[in-house]
Amino acid sequence: MNGRVDYLVTEEEINLTRGPSGLGFNIVGGTDQQYVSNDSGIYVSRIKENGAAALDGRLQEGDKILSVNGQDLKNLLHQDAVDLFRNAGYAVSLRVQHRLQVQNGPIGHRGEGDPSGIPIFMVLVPVFALTMVAAWAFMRYRQQL
């Protein structure tokens, strides 16, 4: 059972407008609350139903928040990060990192992988498509003989 877990990492700018009950999500992380080993970053731990983030639909549980209104979230205490969000104003711009987990190898394996690995389907799909095109061209060529 030694399949590899790869990650497709993407970054996105998400602009949220604070709703009646705020931004509508929870966070974990910080220099004094490392949620991910060797990473003191700030992560989304919960999206609240019908909150601003949920209604927008782009922010996901597990996303890493890199900055708020252009302010870097590196090396912040957990409470300082919370306060930064609370004082961020009505229109809030979030730079977030999404990590899409892609399963390679035997199903059921859930280990840590190389975050920068290329998902196998990105290789297999073009190869499969090329094979199909080649097979079709070969069949057409044989019919003409």
Epitope: G24, Q33, S45
Partner: nanobody, 127 residues
Framework: QVQLVESGGGLVQAGGSLRLSCAAS????????MAWFRQAPGKEREFVAD????????YYADSVKGRFTISRDNAKNTVYLQMNSLKPEDTAVYYC?????????????????????WGQGTQVTVS
Amino acid sequence: QVQLVESGGGLVQAGGSLRLSCAASGRTFSTYTMAWFRQAPGKEREFVADINWNGGSTYYADSVKGRFTISRDNAKNTVYLQMNSLKPEDTAVYYCAAAIGSTVDSYYHSDPLEYDYWGQGTQVTVS
């Protein structure tokens, strides 16, 4: 999946004390916001108290302020509710609740929807 198990409830005379405990499973207990709620027969579930991830911030319902104290021990994955000067109106089933992480919003402490996990409850009866 987090499991919460309450203990310490019982029958006590008015003016007496009880200490409730809530043991949580899961290695990330120290990141949870923890709370106690209670529900008396025929009434809505009512917020009692909550505590942030490291115990640095606590919040209480007006009805228990000065009598109840919430605390936590992250090394033991446990949250406590020390209840002093108990009154008959404190009679209820007491529930422990956990929210993953800290809200980035000004707190809506009293809303049960803020919490992801719930215990089965422990009965407290004040005669």
